[in-house]
């Protein structure tokens, strides 16, 4: 009976979420059949988050809106391990907006979800950031340093990376 009602609830949630994401990929977390964590298909998952690489070229603001419409934000990178996961899905000849900006041009970098900016967990290319007028951050590949961050003008269209918490049903 308990299992039946749990399944009914889960199906009802899935139906509700299908309005926003037509397909979800779910996995059972741990040994407890009660806990399913889901990401929209074809997003990828790492730890407790889902990631989507948006290949449309848009400004930083439009990229963030594109993410938020899907229930996500431009990516906030918290660890080296997270960045190492993300770059597996990126193309070396492209640049991707991060959820990191310096709106005032005073080198007060801030993450879109208000995660505190920690200088010790940043992955800027050497010599970056280097321009007060370049107020948005991208991740790109440089042959000398591999993947790292660079500051650029926010209006210049780029690809982007969206991130959201896993959906629990």
């Amino acid at each position: 009976n308990f299992m039946y009602s749990k399944t009914v609830k889960r199906l009802s949630k899935l139906r509700e979420y299908q309005q926003y994401h037509p397909s979800l990929t779910c996995v059972m977390e741990g040994k407890d059949i009660e806990d399913w964590s889901c990401c929209p298909t074809p997003w990828t998952s790492f730890q407790s988050s889902c990631y989507f690489i948006s290949t449309g070229m848009q400004s930083w603001t439009k990229s963030q809106k594109n993410c938020s419409v899907m229930g996500a934000d431009l990516v906030v990178i918290n660890t080296r391990e997270e960045q190492d996961f993300i770059i597996q899905n990126l193309k070396r000849n492209s640049s991707y907006f991060l959820g990191l900006s310096d709106p005032g041009g005073r080198r007060h970098w801030q993450w879109v979800d208000q995660t505190p900016y920690n200088e010790n967990v940043t992955f800027w290319h050497s010599g970056e950031p280097n321009n007060l007028d370049e107020r948005c951050a991208i991740i790109n590949f440089r042959s000398s340093e591999e993947w790292g961050w660079n500051d650029i003008h926010c209006h210049v269209p780029q690809k982007s990376i969206c991130k959201m918490k896993k959906i629990y049903i």
Epitope: Y17, Y20, T61, Q64, S68, V112, K165, I167
Partner: nanobody, 127 residues
Framework: QVQLQESGGGSVQAGDSLRLSCAAS????????MGWFRQAPGKEREFVAT????????YYADSVKGRFTISRDNAKKSVYLQINSLKTEDAAVYYC????????????????????WGQGTQVTVSS
């Protein structure tokens, strides 16, 4: 797409109360966290209050805490802002905003995280 329409603004005296409403149309309202923001002439848009999809979590700007109350009625697809003890510095255009959220306790205080915005309703406060 979600369309938002604010109402309830007007001209009042300092110390009075107002109830602002924001009606949503389009997609299922219950999947959206909601927020109120305001903008006074010559000033930047400022966060006022936010509420989670379920209504279980709310958060307020320090300047309005204890005087403003945000609430929602998912059946009526509406969010409300009850404003008490109005001050002259509360005069502004008030905007409601919506953002899809799959976490029923999450709330959002940053304007950039909202996808949909209303046209605003004017609140004028005279002393």
């Amino acid at each position: 797409q979600v369309q938002l329409q604010e109402s309830g603004g007007g001209s009042v005296q300092a110390g009075d109360s107002l109830r602002l409403s924001c009606a949503a149309s389009g997609r299922t309202f219950s999947g959206y966290a909601m927020g109120w923001f305001r903008q006074a002439p010559g000033k930047e848009r400022e966060f006022v209050a936010t509420i989670s999809t379920s209504g279980s979590s709310t958060y307020y700007a320090d300047s309005v805490k204890g005087r403003f109350t945000i609430s929602r009625d998912n059946a009526k697809k509406s969010v409300y802002l009850q404003i008490n003890s109005l001050k002259t510095e509360d005069a502004a255009v008030y905007y409601c905003a919506a953002r899809l959220s799959f976490d029923n306790t999450a709330f959002y205080t940053s304007a950039i995280r909202y996808s949909y915005w209303g046209q605003g309703t004017q609140v004028t406060v005279s002393s």
